[in-house]
Interface confidence: low
Amino acid sequence: KIDACKRGDVTVKPSHVILLGSTVNITCSLKPRQGCFHYSRRNKLILYKFDRRINFHHGHSLNSQVTGLPLGTTLFVCKLACINSDEIQICGAEIFVGVAPEQPQNLSCIQKGEQGTVACTWERGRDTHLYTEYTLQLSGPKNLTWQKQCKDIYCDYLDFGINLTPESPESNFTAKVTAVNSLGSSSSLPSTFTFLDIVRPLPPWDIRIKFQKASVSRCTLYWRDEGLVLLNRLRYRPSNSRLWNMVNVTKAKGRHDLLDLKPFTEYEFQISSKLHLYKGSWSDWSESLRAQTPEEEPTGMLDVWYMKRHIDYSRQQISLFWKNLSVSEARGKILHYQVTLQELTGGKAMTQNITGHTSWTTVIPRTGNWAVAVSAANSKGSSLPTRINIMNLCEAGLLAPRQVSANSEGMDNILVTWQPPRKDPSAVQEYVVEWRELHPGGDTQVPLNWLRSRPYNVSALISENIKSYICYEIRVYALSGDQGGCSSILGNSKHKAPLSGPHINAITEEKGSILISWNSIPVQEQMGCLLHYRIYWKERDSNSQPQLCEIPYRVSQNSHPINSLQPRVTYVLWMTALTAAGESSHGNEREFCLQGKAN
């Protein structure tokens, strides 16, 4: 009931708490002398459901049968209306609509650790919408019974606060949960278990790893476990991997040897425990141990390439280049590279350790047979040396690959194709494709890139260190024993018309013709491989079309003669450059008047 109900009463039958779908009778009745002043037949009793009028009646009492009430609480209020006055609240009542508890399902109990306490969980089923009390009962051997109640409306977990011990691991325990409310009760099916069934060990702790003699092949993982643990499972992975390696071990007693770890790799290790082969559940995974495995001496061999440059009649410069070993081959931090240069006939050798970079340049006599060996060293040792005999890589003309072409293949890729050399193609042991940014003046500091290709291949896709709008000098070498032949071509992955034309820096007269000299276009303005230069000229102050001379581009060429100018006529000259994408704007203009005699 609500309010003081001084003027009358509201009664509800059969009960204030009803089952969903039931009908209730609500009666509102006035107490004596509480009706309207003067004439009681003018009493108008009105029944409200929340704030909505559902029934009314003139007189001292009102009866109303109500159906279809929803789950939850519904408020009914009775009011009195008299002529010429506001409605007066008489009394009210709340009706609670709910359901009987469903049978609790999936009752399961667990004890976390040998020293933990038994706690059970279950599924309540549908919401009763009423106050429902849950009672959890645990019975064991020797008529032991524990009982605990939960009065939380959403109760689905209870901890008994008791600890099962392993003294009689086969003893049976039975748990049951009962739900009760004013509309009924229901009990779960009993759940029967032993100590071994429900104890979930604590995750292992104090995990550490030891490498005997700092070797990855002698690695032992140690940990601590609760006393009754029989099984462990270990999982481990390189820190940068998503896939775990899994190992199951029995009676490990807190240690296990791992045989397949990779050197110089950070691993993550976790361990889980279980008390019995087929009973009970696995513990949570332990906290991760992260540890780096020791280095081992490098495996594999360096990929080494070289370049020769003539200095003078007696000396040549050798530039050696090599690629870093992969992480799996380096097996540690590479501390230095060891380069040994040896003159094969005289046996003279020099060795140098190189740190911090992957190239080395030296000057040697042009005479003699020279060989180099390069190896990589970490704290545990060195890789097998890569040995190369220094030869003239382009000396054997008959070994030169034919019809070399270079074509753009998508963003920042160039597809290089060739035909085998005329000389017996089966003599080719491998091809090497080499590329470097084209720099006028042949700057030897420009980084060199290369890849090796099997003798049956006639194409290679180069993508490493390829930039758009840069011209690359590409060479294809065919190697056979101590001989090599090569062919070269220029190529780019993307091109545009050059951003500027060549700058004419001098015009000189020689025997009735002129020699034009120009500065190369800066590399960053060439926008790809140059194909041609054009020299334009016309008479000064003339409106006629200029004449032009087109010169194929050659890296080293920076001058060209023109012999078709008339003497004592002033000409204006300028130059442009062309890539496959088009022609540049004009370079600077120069005037020139040929002084020679007329014919």
Epitope: G356, H357, T358, S359, Q445, V446, P447
Partner: nanobody, 115 residues
């Protein structure tokens, strides 16, 4: 894009000292190994020194060991090269680079050692 600006060069007598600075921008300096190169008049580019991204590992060419110290300040995106006991053969343009080939380098700063 990558920008490297060297400074601190100058003329100095043999036995003198200089500190070269390289201000870096346009890339993640703190995760990049850094390098110093030099180019003497009429000679090719020569590697001088390198330092790991965290600064823990340093490397030097034999001719400068004991006289040159490379260091870095990742908070300031700055690389340093301290030159001590300078000799006439140290005369060169000094460049800092973010790659070990010297391809990505700055404009350079001139160091001249003469009496």
């Amino acid at each position: 894009q990558v920008q490297l600006q060297e400074s601190g060069g100058g003329s100095v007598q043999p036995g003198g000292s200089l500190r070269l600075t390289c201000a870096a921008s346009g890339f993640t300096f703190s995760t990049s190994g850094m390098h110093w190169f030099r180019q003497a008049p009429g000679k090719g580019l020569e590697w001088v020194s390198s330092i790991s991204s965290g600064g823990g590992d340093t490397y030097y060419t034999d001719s400068v060991k004991g006289r040159i110290t490379i260091s870095r300040d990742n908070a300031k995106n700055t690389l340093y090269l301290q030159l001590n006991d300078l000799k006439s053969e140290d005369t060169a343009v000094y460049y800092c680079s973010k790659d070990p080939s010297g391809a990505t380098r700055g404009q350079g700063t001139q160091v001249t050692v003469s009496s």
